[in-house]
Interface confidence: low
């Protein structure tokens, strides 16, 4: 019998260029008579054009929703009702070809063609894209607040904020033909729930979404987004009601930046330069294609690419890369944004050089990608360290911390976190090395103490990049480096001339002169430590809540001992900058560190002095007794302490702590406390210092109070941010 054919709705969106009409400002106002009249004519023309082709039998509905420059561009959508089996056949490309064919067939025709009655449509200016019913609904919901803007070359146009009576608005942006649009979004409030979506076409087509941002992001206070060409749409969806725009939008046309380079690297190791996507740090555009060719001077070297918060991964199946596709030596890799550093090491087997391609495979893009490139020695990629094949990084080996995710850097160590005697491979503790007392059989621990040695896990790197064998040589009153750099920046870590914390005792004035109290509206929230004349270090999680993210809220007190009273040695500061570690992850507490820049430099006194910062190679030996200080609760769940408390805690081996916390302890964490509990940090101590006293009498910052299970509980140690694990970021910011 007769079987009804299943029909489906296929939605298309597009634009066409009219050569015999000109755009006018009237056409940007939907309520104007000019807009209504032009829309009626354009709708008629569009319908006639479609019905003049084989598509006519499938025509369902259409709408012209906007106009733009060029001389006049009409933006439209239409729906065809088509048999299901023809769905794939009538792709946007096929539909565009049919319409263009129709337009071309009548260009020189003298016969009357209905759709050419008023409009001369440019066949080359017709664009048809795939859309969906959902896209049209999204577009229609913005039409009550629809703004068209043309931005000329050399112009930066600040867009008018949304209409707060509307729940959704659309900015339709257009620039000169051969340029690309760059949109800048700046969040101006600390908190909001607004949502903005940027599209690579004139309307909100989901398949052409470049990116969407939500709720006054602290991670990205400024976002710059590139379109692939001269058209873009931005859709705003209202969050909480606000009389103030929580963002500022501006747009400018920019020229296409070539992303191709040929480089020959020098005969030296380490970073030699930077490759980046066009207009970095802007988001890369949806049709980015970069091709970098690097020539390596000799086959002794491999090429290293060092990424920041971005990694390359092999896709097990041929799925598209959603965060950038890379091809390196014909190997396909996908980019992935991560909160970790990463290096890709490329073995070089031919002098022809290496070609690296980066492509945005889909319209969805992301933050621009920057990569440092350089050489490494193929026969010894990580001198004195371990090459972590999981992430391509050189990490310290056998230092008691599993820096490599698979832990291979700590496997099968003859001497873990100790010095290996040359004579018989016996292990001695690091403080015994270069201490003037031979401990190894033939005294190999006291050899080469006055000369440079190859750099390794526990060697100290001097400013001239040479290394010394003596562990922890900083600020011990004796120059060990040829350039004396181990004794520079040593005005730190000394206590004042002075004679909460669970299980602690009250501190005296000047005893911990680096201790900071971070307060909001007169209330102590977190601890911190002074590390330089204008910088205080604390935990990133202190600013976790959006309401705590603004610098204006915070006051920093130094030289303070009592919370309920002031004394002459006490000073206060406002905060001019707040920087969270870029890899900080709230859920895991990883990289739990933040830096506060004070509004003016400190004047050093007996009560206000910085603590010493350790070098990356500084070794805080497990078992060592160190001190934590703060005004935190004196018992779990209790109120904060009035007096600054101090308590000694023991440093715990990483593997033991990791076991207790079921392997949630990362290499940026350090544990301290006691198996039996009792002495520990507590609520309100967060961000405060864990300090250890060196043989020189100076105090070095080993950790920051970060997290733990309860306070002082048996078998649960306190977990601290490991300063040696984040020191390179601290130094980069502070210097």
């Amino acid at each position: 019998g007769y079987k009804a054919e299943v029909m489906v709705s296929q939605v298309y969106s597009g634009s066409l260029r009219v050569l015999n009409r000109h755009f006018s400002q009237d056409l940007t106002r939907r309520e104007s008579s000019a807009f209504r009249s032009e829309t009626a004519k354009a709708q008629k023309m569009l319908k006639e054009l479609i019905t003049s082709t084989r598509l006519g039998t499938y025509y369902n509905s259409s709408s012209v929703y906007s106009f733009g420059e060029g001389p006049l561009t009409c933006f439209f959508w239409f729906i065809l009702q088509i048999p299901e089996h023809r769905r794939l056949m009538l792709s946007p490309e096929v539909v565009q070809a049919l319409l263009v064919e129709e337009l071309l067939s009548t260009v020189n025709s003298s016969a009357a063609v209905p759709y050419r009655a008023e409009y001369e449509v440019d066949p080359e200016g017709l664009v048809i894209l795939e859309a969906s019913v959902k896209d049209i609904a999204a577009l229609n919901s913005t039409l009550g607040c629809y703004r068209y803007s043309y931005v000329g070359q050399g112009q930066v146009l600040r867009l008018k904020g949304p209409d707060h009576l509307a729940s959704s608005c659309l900015w339709h942006l257009q620039g000169p033909k051969d340029l690309m649009l760059k949109l800048r979004l700046e969040w101006t409030l600390a908190e909001c729930r607004d949502r903005l979506a940027m599209y690579d076409v004139a309307g909100p087509l989901e398949k052409r979404l470049i990116t969407s941002v939500y709720g006054c992001s602290r991670q990205e206070p400024v976002v710059e987004v590139l379109a692939s060409g001269a058209i873009m749409a931005v859709v705003w969806k209202k969050g909480l009601h606000s009389y103030y725009d929580p963002f500022v939008l501006s747009v400018q046309p920019v020229v296409f930046q070539a992303c191709e380079v040929n480089l020959t690297l020098d005969n030296r190791l380490d970073s030699q330069g930077v490759l980046s996507t066009p207009y970095f740090p802007s988001y890369y555009s949806p049709q980015t294609h970069c091709s970098w060719h690097l020539t390596v001077p000799s086959l002794d070297y491999g090429l290293a690419l060092w990424f920041d918060a971005y990694a390359l991964r092999r896709q097990k199946y041929d799925l598209p890369c959603t965060q950038g596709q890379w091809t390196i030596q014909n190997r396909r890799l996908c980019g992935l944004r991560i909160l970790q550093p990463y290096a890709e090491r490329i073995p070089v087997v031919a002098t022809a050089g290496i070609t690296i391609n980066f492509t945005s495979q889909i319209s969805l893009t992301g933050p621009g990608v920057r990569v440092h490139y350089g050489l490494y020695n193929q026969s010894d990629p990580c001198p004195g360290e371990f090459l972590c094949s999981v992430n391509g990084l050189c990490v310290p080996a056998c230092d008691g911390v599993k820096d490599c995710p698979n832990g291979l850097d700590e496997r099968n160590c003859v001497c873990r976190a100790t010095f290996q005697c040359k004579e018989d491979s016996t292990c001695i503790s690091l403080p015994k090395v270069c201490d003037g007392q031979p401990d190894c059989l033939n005294g190999s621990d006291e050899e080469q103490c006055q000369e440079g040695v190859p750099c390794g896990t526990f060697t100290f790197q001097c400013e001239d990049r040479s290394c010394v064998k003596k562990p922890n040589p900083q600020c011990d009153g004796r120059p060990d480096c040829r350039d004396g750099s181990d004794e520079e920046h040593c005005d730190c870590g000394l206590q004042g001339p002075s004679s909460r914390i669970v299980g602690g005792a009250v501190s005296s004035e000047g005893e911990w002169p680096w201790q900071a109290s971070l307060q909001v509206r007169g209330r102590h929230i977190c601890g911190g430590a002074l590390i330089a004349d204008r910088w205080v270090i604390t935990a990133a999680h202190c600013f976790q809540e959006d309401s705590m993210a603004s610098t204006v809220l915070w006051t920093v007190f130094l030289g303070k001992v009592w919370q309920n009273s002031r004394w002459p040695g006490e000073v206060s500061f406002k905060v001019s900058r707040l920087l969270l570690h870029p890899y900080h992850e709230e859920d895991s507490h990883d990289y739990d560190v933040a830096l506060l820049q004070l509004d003016h430099p400190v004047v050093r006194s007996a009560a206000v002095r910085p603590v010493c910062l350790p070098a990356r190679s500084h070794f805080f030996e497990p078992g060592l007794h160190c001190w934590i200080t703060g005004w935190g609760a004196l018992r779990e769940g209790g109120p904060i302490s009035n007096a600054l408390q101090k308590v000694d805690v023991q440093l715990i081996p990483q593997d033991l702590c990791s076991e207790v916390y079921r392997y949630q302890v990362t290499p940026r964490m350090l544990c301290a406390g006691y198996r039996k509990g009792k002495k520990d940090a507590c609520q309100g101590d967060s961000g405060g210092p864990l300090v250890c006293k060196a043989l020189s009498g100076r105090w070095f910052l080993a950790g920051l109070v970060s997290w733990g299970l309860g306070c002082g509980r048996p078998n649960y140690f306190g977990v601290y941010t490991r300063i040696t694990g984040v020191i390179s970021w601290i130094q980069q910011v502070v210097t």
Partner: antibody, heavy 122, light 108 residues
Framework: QLQLQESGPGLVKPAETLSLMCTVS??????????WGWIRQPPGKGLEWIGS???????YYNPSLKSRVTISVDTSNNQFSLKLRSVTAADTAVYYC??????????????WGQGTLVTVSS | SYELTQPPSVSVSPGQTARITCSAD??????AYWYQQKPGQAPLLVIY???ERPSGIPERFSGSSSGTIVTLTIRGVQAEDEADYYC???????????FGGGTKLTVL
């Protein structure tokens, strides 16, 4: 063409230490791209991975054998060795040295020696 | 300890298709590799990364992966394909190499 050649005694007494050497030709052990390892196969049975080593000396072992195994490297002679302590009759097997491609998601053995039979018997 | 499970034996007539399976929990995350071992010889890698064939391996050998099961397929089996076949992968951390128990392929 890469070749691996095992050498060592074919007979070891119980409780003693089994020692084998693998000589690599056609590639440098110090190539930063590969691990080098040992696999064994008891007569009539399946394959068992013993452990692998990176040229820098970093090693990792099958957890079931870890307490008895040492794999070490001699880069100057392009050789690596296996020591298995306190052997019993259960350690009688053909021992293969292999090149272990263990980079990123890869984890396989692309070149094998021809194998050497070691019998544990008094 | 982590294990890969294979059938002990598979028999097939010449010209037919042989399928050997291997299952384990980590296989969706870790690649599988297949080795052929003939009597008195060292194993030979015939499939790597689930489905890729090293150069020199005949096209009749192919591999596939679906969830926790990987399959070695030999189409148009020949007498010379009679051998033991071992699948190999890694534990879920990617640290340790693990072999299946092996499958004896008999060509009838």
């Amino acid at each position: 063409q890469l070749q691996l050649q095992e050498s060592g005694p074919g007979l070891v007494k119980p409780a003693e230490t089994l020692s084998l050497m693998c000589t690599v030709s056609g590639d440098s052990i110090s190539s930063s791209h590969y691990f080098w390892g040992w696999i064994r196969q008891p007569p009539g049975k399946g394959l068992e991975w013993i452990g692998s080593m990176y040229y820098s000396g970093s090693t990792y072992y099958n957890p079931s054998l870890k307490s008895r195994v040492t794999i070490s490297v001699d880069t100057s002679n392009n050789q690596f060795s296996l020591k298995l302590r306190s052997v019993t009759a259960a350690d009688t097997a053909v021992y293969y040295c292999v090149r272990h491609n263990n980079w990123g998601l890869d984890n396989y053995f692309d070149y094998w020696g021809q194998g050497t039979l070691v019998t544990v018997s008094s | 300890s982590y294990e890969l499970t294979q059938p002990p034996s598979v028999s097939v007539s010449p010209g037919q298709t042989a399928r050997i399976t291997c299952s384990a929990d980590a296989l969706p995350d870790q690649y599988a590799y297949w080795y052929q071992q003939k009597p008195g010889q060292a194993p030979l890698l015939v499939i790597y990364k689930d489905s890729e064939r090293p150069s020199g391996i005949p096209e009749r050998f192919s591999g596939s992966s679906s969830g926790t099961i990987v399959t070695l397929t030999i189409r148009g089996v020949q007498a010379e394909d009679e051998a033991d076949y071992y699948c190999q992968s890694a534990d879920s951390s990617g640290s340790y190499a693990v072999f299946g128990g092996g499958t004896k392929l008999t060509v009838l």
